[in-house]
Interface confidence: medium
């Protein structure tokens, strides 16, 4: 069937439209286009004869129409009058006629709208505002946007005049927003610039800050007032009812008890004509004395002496407070407070008790803190540490050993080699060492105040070659998927290359394997049962290369989900039931059985002779590994038929 399609159907003024013909018959003589829904010679636009390829304009031809050989009609520079129906009249070669009608609509391109308002400065809770979208346009739809969102549902918002007018009743400060209107028709949509609604409000009840109402004599009083208001409020201060100044802030330096009283802030909005006030009562107290701490022992010895700290001066009916390290007192059996909290006693002091300590006196207004006091606890020396940690040195290098022991006052150090005193210094330096410098190096640390001394002995070997290495481990029985293991290749030596092998192969590339400490330490993160292998470390220098004995990692794992065998679940009455349970586990797990939830025996094998249908039910094997602390189980249903 012959049809006409209008592309587009809705056409903007000044644009073009194509009347596209579908299913045009074969063997045509020609065709004509007419304005309207019927063939009317007075309204012919154009005719076309196929044989001559001749187009002939008709009375309704405007010069904007173009006809195509496929009968389609293009109309350019569309005007409003072009709206309507168009009829195609087709004359076939057998002179039989056929007709089809199409149509389109013409709409104007909309201008950019603007918003007019009946009240530029509405007052909160009093005024209404009507926004109107200009200009008024026929066949246009009007939309409104608030802060780029569609209109909220509110009984105070009303659309009228075909949505062209938006009225806000009883405006509030929250209506202060960006308003836009939009006009739409089938061919265009335009938005206005935004209009900001300026709602006058306030002042609200002012707030006075800071909130504290108690001050000490000699302090500065600095009060600030603020009230929500549009336009911003004008402020006035009154003290005990007497006007002071018209400012937002009130400042009185070096106050005395006489400055106690009622302080009023008044906020005024000149546009709304409203006033609001807030009153605060300020109390000024006389200054109490600053406390200080006295001690009965200025140099206590660790683990021997007690110290009593006393907060001075003694004042009747006063609360005393204490702080250690800027924290309130911890609960400790070594800390004791006297009945009035004025004396703090530390029993058997340790080096961690140095403080600082502060005491405080509490009055009506605040807490007065003492200056901090630090205890000089005498301690140590602890066992000295000798660094570096190398035990092997090659001939010809310089030996530089340093000794350190935690001590107060700092320790005095002495060095001995093979029992013979060398020097009284913290560091020992020997240049260009030979194998004769091998021996026992002793560092002795002495605390002159406590009279204590401690020693550490280190064996130093001077040799160009290295010994056979050995592997030390930080965890001999790691748990699978939980623990990490660090293997360290001993000894630690200068100018040495450290190498590792696993099961005789060089280390595999794995994110769980990490070398550190100059390759001397091999760490396995999140060990798995597959890590239970032989680990060997090697050391290499210019004259020696050797491997350690293998260390096999014993990874604790499991128990995995057990397996009950045989897999059969159906038995004949009178048969023997012999179930075996197995679970991969290291060490081997403990086994137990339950039948229908009732505990049975703690064995790996469950045997029941000459079973009957009474033995039907669920058979559960439970496994537990005491080393990993993990459990597992499996349930099997057994059916016995008569």
């Amino acid at each position: 069937k012959l049809t006409i399609e209008s592309t587009p159907f809705n056409v903007a003024e000044g644009k073009e439209v194509l009347l596209l013909v579908h299913n045009l018959p074969q063997h045509l003589f020609g065709y004509s286009w007419y304005k309207g829904e019927r063939v009317d010679g007075n309204r012919q636009i154009i005719g076309y004869v196929i044989g001559t390829q001749q187009a002939t304009p008709g009375p309704a031809y405007s010069g904007r129409e173009i006809i195509y050989p496929n009968a389609s009609l293009l109309i350019q520079n569309i005007i409003q009058n072009d709206t309507g129906f168009y009829t195609l009249h087709v004359i076939k070669s057998d002179l039989v006629n056929e007709e089809a009608t199409g149509q389109f609509r013409v709409y104007p391109e909309l201008p950019k709208p603007s918003i007019s308002s009946n009240n530029s400065k509405p007052v909160e809770d009093k005024d209404a505002v009507a926004f109107t979208c200009e200009p008024e346009t026929q066949d246009a739809t009007y939309l409104w946007w608030v802060n780029n969102q569609s209109l909220p549902v509110s009984p105070r918002l009303q659309l009228s005049n075909g949505n062209r007018t938006l009225t806000l009743f009883n405006v509030t400060r929250n209506d202060t927003a960006s308003y836009k209107c939009e006009t739409q028709n089938p061919v265009s949509a335009r938005r206005s610039d935004s209009v900001i609604l300026n709602v006058l409000y306030g002042p609200d009840a002012p707030t006075i800050s800071p909130l504290n109402t108690s001050y000490r004599s000699g302090e500065n009083l600095n009060l600030s007032c603020h009230a929500a208001s549009n336009p911003p409020a004008q402020y006035s201060w009154f003290v005990n009812g007497t006007f002071q100044q018209s400012t937002q802030e009130l400042f009185i330096p070096n106050i005395t008890v006489n400055n106690s009283g009622s302080y009023t802030c008044q906020a005024h909005n000149s546009d709304t004509g409203l006033n609001r006030t807030t009153v605060t009562t300020i109390t000024v107290y006389a200054e109490p004395p600053k406390p200080f701490i006295t001690s009965n022992n200025s140099n206590p010895v660790e683990d021997e002496d007690a110290v009593a700290l006393t907060c001075e001066p003694e004042i009747q009916n006063t609360t005393y407070l204490w702080w250690v390290n800027n924290q309130s007192l911890p609960v400790s059996p070594r800390l004791q407070l006297s009945n009035d909290n004025r004396t703090l006693t530390l029993l058997s002091v340790t080096r961690n008790d140095v403080g600082p300590y502060e005491c405080g006196i509490q009055n009506e207004l605040s807490v007065d803190h003492s200056d901090p006091v630090i205890l000089n606890v005498l301690y140590g020396p602890d066992d000295p540490t000798i660094s570096p940690s190398y035990t092997y040195y090659r001939p010809g290098v310089n030996l530089s050993l340093s000794c350190h022991a935690a001590s107060n006052p700092p320790a005095q150090y002495s060095w001995l080699i093979d029992g013979n005193i060398q020097q009284h210094t913290q560091e020992l330096f020997i240049s260009n060492i030979t194998e004769k410098n091998s021996g026992l190096y002793t560092c002795q640390a002495n605390n002159s105040a406590s009279g204590h001394s401690r020693t550490t002995v280190k064996t130093i070997t001077v040799s160009a070659e290295l010994p056979k290495p050995s592997i030390s481990s930080n965890n001999s029985k790691p748990v699978e998927d939980k623990d990490a293991v660090a293997f360290t290749c001993e000894p630690e030596a200068q100018n040495t290359t450290y190498l590792w092998w696993v099961n005789g192969q060089s280390l595999p590339v794995s994110p769980r394997l990490q070398l550190s400490n100059g390759n001397r330490t091999l760490t396995l993160f999140n060990v798995t049962r597959n890590d239970a292998r032989a680990y060997v470390c090697g050391i290499q220098n210019s004259v020696s290369a050797n491997r350690s004995d293998p260390v096999t990692l014993d990874v604790l794992y499991g128990p995995d989900t057990p397996i009950i065998s045989p897999p059969d679940s159906s038995y004949l009455s009178g048969a023997n039931l012999n179930l075996s349970c197995h679970s991969a586990s290291n060490p081997s797990p403990q086994y137990s059985w339950r039948i229908n939830g009732i505990p049975q025996q703690h064995t790996q094998v469950l045997f029941i002779a000459k079973i009957t249908p009474n033995n039907n039910g669920t058979y559960a094997c439970f496994v537990s590994n005491l080393a990993t602390g993990r459990n597992n189980s499996i349930v099997k249903s057994i059916t016995v038929s008569a």
Epitope: P395, G396, T434, E435, K436, S438, T461, V462, S463, A464, E465, P467, K468, T497, L499, G538, Q540, S542, V543, S544, A545, N546, R547
Partner: antibody, heavy 120, light 105 residues
Framework: QVKLEQSGAEVVKPGASVKLSCKAS????????MHWLRQGPGQRLEWIGW????????EYAPKFQGKATFTTDTSANTAYLGLSSLRPEDTAVYYC?????????????WGQGTLVTVSS | NVLTQSPSSMSVSVGDRVTIACSAS?????MHWLQQKPGKSPKLLIY???NLASGVPSRFSGSGSGTDYSLTISSVQPEDAATYYC?????????FGGGTKLEIK
């Protein structure tokens, strides 16, 4: 398979110089140290020193300082011993020797030796 | 560090037990032993005082400490005829003993 192949015998006049080679196969010389030793007729073994082919570090026995020079060509996997100002008492079999890091120890792989005869 | 071996030579029968001594002029933590057959390169026999090198028969053993070390062959075999050297690697220069020549009667 680890193997050290040394260059052939040399006969030189006193005061002359000579350069001996030691080609390694079965391992990369950069992974190890190369030692040189010598053994005079009916004499004990003498250690000349070592070279680290990776960085060129060397250590010489005091007796051979100025007499011996160690070099390597890592691309050819070869170590060289240069001997200068030769005297009749330098007549000896010169050995190259090393121990791979896979060990267990150094001095477990030896070249077949190069006889150097110093004679006028 | 001078190494002195004794004896300098010895002649023994197959099956005999043989001990070769090596004395160091100053203390060393380890001693090593090499075997050299006539016309051949030396071969590592024992390292770090008592460890057998790869492929060395168990009849060979080493012991000692400080300045005195020894190599023992528990039951001499014909193929053991060779010169045996001790070696120290603790201090530079590395040094060798004068050698002990072992002959089989």
């Amino acid at each position: 398979q680890v193997k050290l192949e040394q260059s052939g015998a040399e006969v030189v006049k006193p005061g002359a110089s000579v350069k001996l080679s030691c080609k390694a196969s079965g391992f990369n010389i950069k992974d190890s140290y190369m030692h040189w030793l010598r053994q005079g007729p009916g004499q004990r073994l003498e250690w000349i020193g070592w070279i680290d082919p990776e960085n060129g570090d060397t250590e010489y026995a005091p007796k051979f300082q100025g007499k011996a020079t160690f070099t390597t060509d890592t691309s050819a996997n070869t170590a060289y011993l240069g001997l200068s100002s030769l005297r009749p008492e330098d007549t000896a079999v010169y050995y190259c020797n090393e121990g791979t890091p896979t060990g267990p120890y150094y001095f477990d792989y030896w070249g077949q030796g190069t006889l150097v005869t110093v004679s006028s | 560090n001078v190494l002195t071996q004794s004896p300098s030579s010895m002649s023994v029968s197959v099956g005999d037990r043989v001990t070769i001594a090596c004395s160091a002029s100053s203390s060393v933590p380890y001693m090593h032993w090499l075997q050299q057959k006539p016309g051949k390169s030396p071969k590592l026999l024992i390292y770090l005082t008592s460890n057998l090198a790869s492929g060395v028969p168990s009849r060979f053993s080493g012991s000692g400490s400080g300045t005195d070390y020894s190599l023992t062959i528990s039951s001499v075999q014909p193929e053991d005829a060779a010169t045996y050297y001790c070696q120290q690697r603790s201090s530079y220069p590395l040094t060798f003993g004068g050698g002990t020549k072992l002959e089989i009667k």
